[in-house]
Amino acid sequence: ARNGDDCPLGPGRCCRLHTVRASLEDLGWADWVLSPREVQVTMCIGACPSQFRAANMHAQIKTSLHRLKPDTVPAPCCVPASYNPMVLIQKTDTGVSLQTYDDLLAKDCHCI
Amino acid sequence: ARNGDDCPLGPGRCCRLHTVRASLEDLGWADWVLSPREVQVTMCIGACPSQFRAANMHAQIKTSLHRLKPDTVPAPCCVPASYNPMVLIQKTDTGVSLQTYDDLLAKDCHCI
């Protein structure tokens, strides 16, 4: 797979980690989360041109078949390869609790 | 997550397993694979409307932020949740060998 910065479509156009600032209201969490009031959400965004950050053999197949049958087979998609945990202070019936979520913030990205 | 068949866009339009028939030439494998000559490639294709087969919390966040910022944040993407292994009879310098690949054929799908 090509280096993450070596995007044939131009710098920053290919699959990579982006940060999107979001409030509890944006996320639909205001009724059950107390803190943080704002989250720096890391997510995977960008195009997946041929073999760019291909996650596995399946991604390579998908690239080949997308080239042949673009109307039937979609190009690989930019998704998280791993996650960073995040703690939320949650509202409960009796007060608050700390809860760690392991699948909330993308840590790095690949194409699949 | 909704049941896999409960697609709000109409039957078969949402993220699900599809089979695409492909030759060794289609896959670009003809120079290094001897058998099979044709593969029934299972892959994940289809739309990921709100909370449909959401893989995790990250997918739920992505749905919320895509609704708010559709030009910045893409909708979740239909990708394999797990894989079925496949054996290939590979050409080697001296003849052939059997090689099993664990990440080649999608077994089931989710949105992320």
């Epitope: - | 001897l34 058998s35 099979p36 079925n84 496949m86 054996v87 009879i89 059997l98 099993t100 080649l104």
Partner: antibody, heavy 118, light 107 residues
């Protein structure tokens, strides 16, 4: 590494049903392209293909024996079974199971001798 | 059923000799033929796949050739450990069939 181990009754009487089991390791019976075949060899004679079962549960039988043969698999136990009904002395042979990959027999078990005698 | 006819049925050769075994199919097989070696008291072992491809671990003195109806297994320089019965097999169509075998001995 790949291993196949046949097990059977050893001795049977005519008209009984032969039940054989092949226990495999080193590969999965659900792997696309994989199968298990049964082949027999009467002592001092050649090889005769009996049946095989594929990863997707497709089954094929030797047409001459089809009415007497049943093949099945239990993927969770890594086992393939073969039943041969109404045996006669002509069914006395070493029975082999073999790993198949796209129609050839890539790796064979050690075989189990089955004798049919009254 | 497809018949696979091997010749010769018996072969005696000296160490170092070049040995050739042939297999003739009763109909066109393309290259869907395999060869196996069975040493005394052992199960068969895969040698050649798709008429001409040596299986991993098989010594390079073994080679296969042919397509259609005529196939050949060649041992370029016979070794004492090659004493065995050799079988061809077609997997072009069901039922799979084997040749009757060629017994190879050392002179």
């Amino acid at each position: 590494q790949v291993q196949l181990q046949e097990s059977g009754p050893g001795l049977l009487k005519p008209s009984q049903t032969l039940s054989l089991t092949c226990t495999v390791s080193g590969f999965s019976l659900s792997t696309y392209g994989m199968g298990v075949g049964w082949i027999r060899q009467p002592l001092g004679k050649g090889l005769e293909w009996l049946a095989n079962i594929w990863w997707n549960d497709d089954k094929y039988y030797n047409s001459a024996l089809k009415s007497r043969l049943t093949i099945s698999k239990d993927t969770s136990k890594n086992q393939v079974s073969l039943k041969l009904s109404s045996v006669t002395a002509a069914d006395t042979a070493v029975y082999y199971c073999a790993q198949m990959a796209y129609s050839w027999f890539a790796y064979w078990g050690q075989g189990t001798l089955v004798t049919v005698s009254s | 059923d497809i018949q696979m006819t091997q010749s010769p049925s018996f072969l005696s050769a000296s160490v170092g000799d070049r040995v050739t075994i042939t297999c003739k199919a009763s109909q066109n097989m393309d290259t869907n033929v395999a060869w196996y070696q069975q040493k005394p008291g052992q199960p068969p072992k895969a040698l050649i796949y798709s008429a001409s491809y040596r299986y991993s671990g098989v010594p390079d003195r073994f080679s296969g050739s042919g397509s259609g109806t005529d196939f050949t297994l060649t041992i370029s320089s016979l070794q004492a450990e090659d004493v065995a019965v050799y079988y061809c097999q077609q997997y072009n169509s069901y039922p799979f069939t084997f040749g009757q075998g060629t017994k190879l001995e050392i002179k």
